[in-house]
Interface confidence: low
């Protein structure tokens, strides 16, 4: 028996359902009583789901997995993972044994989009050219870790005096806070771009400092 899976990682958004595709080619006369199917975490060998002795043995992994029972006899051994969490990320191995045995691994990459950044300025009044200001760009609830880029009004990257921190909440999602310290020119626009490297999603925020008032 030959097991086939997607070579590309499966990308799943947090709280959505994901299908980890796995298939085999059944011989003529194949019956489910002959099938032993096991899904497990590749690295730790933890059992996720199994089908043995002619029946679905159910989920061994937080009760959020399911097979496609009507499609098994056609060679579809795919696994449905419901309400995906950050902790589900990783490699899953599909083992199929009929008379002989084969296995293959498929990777699950979890992702969550970042919110539109909010911009704050300190100090936020009585600003004059030559003043040092601190601009903070905050974006929330994304995954995996963000890449943060700063640019001035002409699109020139600002790399000096940038400090970025990312904190995970109890669900494993990241809040990113990036701080730019800059000396004010006469007029200036400062833009922050928060990029999700998996989704290739960019979230933009900017602040324009003129004489007054401030524009966000």
């Amino acid at each position: 028996v030959e097991v086939q899976v997607s070579e590309d990682p499966v990308v799943a958004l947090v709280d959505t359902d994901a299908t980890l595709r796995c298939s085999f080619s059944p011989e003529p006369g194949f019956s489910l009583a002959q099938l032993n199917l096991i899904w497990q975490l590749t690295d730790t060998k933890q059992l996720v789901h199994s089908f043995t002795e002619g029946r679905d043995q159910g989920s061994a992994y937080s009760n959020r997995t399911a097979l496609f029972p009507d499609l098994l006899v056609q060679g579809n051994a795919s696994l449905r993972l419901q309400r995906v969490r950050v902790t589900d990320e990783g490699s899953y191995t599909c083992f199929v044994s009929i008379q002989d045995f084969d296995s293959a691994a498929v990777s699950l990459q979890v992702a969550a989009p970042y919110s539109k950044p909010s911009m704050t300025l300190e100090p936020n009044k009585d600003l004059r050219p030559g003043n040092m200001v601190t601009i903070t760009c905050s974006s929330y609830q994304g995954y995996p870790e963000a890449e943060v880029f700063w640019k001035d009004g002409q699109g020139v990257p600002l790399t000096g005096n940038v400090t970025t921190s990312q904190m995970a909440n109890e669900r494993g999602l990241f809040d990113v806070h990036s701080v730019l310290r800059v000396v004010l020119g006469a007029n200036g626009t400062y833009s922050c771009l928060v990029r999700n490297p998996v989704l290739q999603q960019d979230a933009h925020g900017s602040v324009t400092i003129t004489g007054q008032p401030l524009t966000f």
């Epitope: 690295d43 990320e89 995996p144 963000a146 890449e147 904190m167 995970a168 494993g172 490297p197 998996v198």
Partner: antibody, heavy 120, light 108 residues
Framework: DVQLVESGGGVVRPGESLTLSCAAS????????VSWVRQAPGEGLEWVSG???????YYADSVKGRFTISRDDSNNTLYLQMNSLRAEDTAVYYC??????????????WGLGTLVTVSS | EVVLTQSPGTLTLSPGERATLSCRAS??????LAWYQQKPGQAPRLLIY???TRATGIPARFSGSGSGTEFTLTINSLQSEDFAVYYC??????????FGGGTKVEIK
């Protein structure tokens, strides 16, 4: 088989620099997070720095601004550039792999470590 | 940062006895806790992660329990190869990732 092999340790004077390397095999270094963890003689473990699969870098406060973590994907190698070394940086430095793309996790594989001694 | 406090500092036991090691977090880390074993001159070795899950190849005599701020590593029927230093590590609130100070399990 997953393997991590550190090198580059040695004896340096306070204020000097050193670069540690960690050659990884058995996995692709940009598909996992990898960290540096150190252990001073007779002491416990201290996380120093980590880099996620997507290249985001983090540092312990004790080394921020002095140490730089980086990697060379083509050579599957992790680096730790250590500047302005102090006596308290003396330790065995371990390279450790997280079992996920993001580094905020436990470490399932460790190297054997390389000893850095900072002494005048 | 989350501070992990391990107790006791040293545990002196005979082979065949049960070892109970404690790790206390300064604030809740849910179940994001791992345990490592380290022998002299060797790198740490992962034993337990997510508080209760044994790593690949770890014998069933090692078990973990707890949640929130109180965690326990239990080694049933100590074998000669189990005498080592044990560290807990949290990965819930970071940076930084933090380790406990260690518990040495030594032969009586």
């Amino acid at each position: 088989d997953v393997q991590l092999v550190e090198s580059g340790g040695g004896v340096v004077r306070p204020g000097e620099s050193l670069t540690l390397s960690c050659a990884a095999s058995g996995f692709t270094i940009n598909s996992y997070a990898v960290s540096w963890v150190r252990q001073a003689p007779g002491e416990g473990l201290e996380w120093v720095s980590g880099i996620s699969g997507s290249g985001v870098r983090y540092y312990a406060d004790s080394v921020k601004g002095r140490f730089t973590i980086s990697r060379d994907d083509s050579n599957n190698t992790l680096y730790l550039q250590m500047n302005s070394l102090r006596a308290e940086d003396t330790a065995v430095y371990y390279c450790a792999r997280s079992n996920k793309v993001t580094w905020n996790n436990f470490f399932d594989y460790w190297g054997l470590g390389t000893l850095v001694t900072v002494s005048s | 940062e989350v501070v992990l406090t391990q107790s006791p500092g040293t545990l002196t036991l005979s082979p065949g006895e049960r070892a109970t090691l404690s790790c206390r977090a300064s604030r809740s880390i849910l179940t994001s806790l791992a345990w490592y074993q380290q022998k002299p001159g060797q790198a740490p070795r992962l034993l337990i992660y997510n508080t209760v899950t044994r790593a690949t190849g770890i014998p069933a005599r090692f078990s973990g329990s707890g949640s929130g701020t109180e965690f326990t590593l239990t080694i049933n029927s100590l074998q000669s190869e189990d005498f080592a230093v044990y560290y807990c590590q949290q990965y819930y609130d970071w940076p930084p990732l933090t380790f406990g100070g260690g518990t040495k399990v030594e032969i009586k």
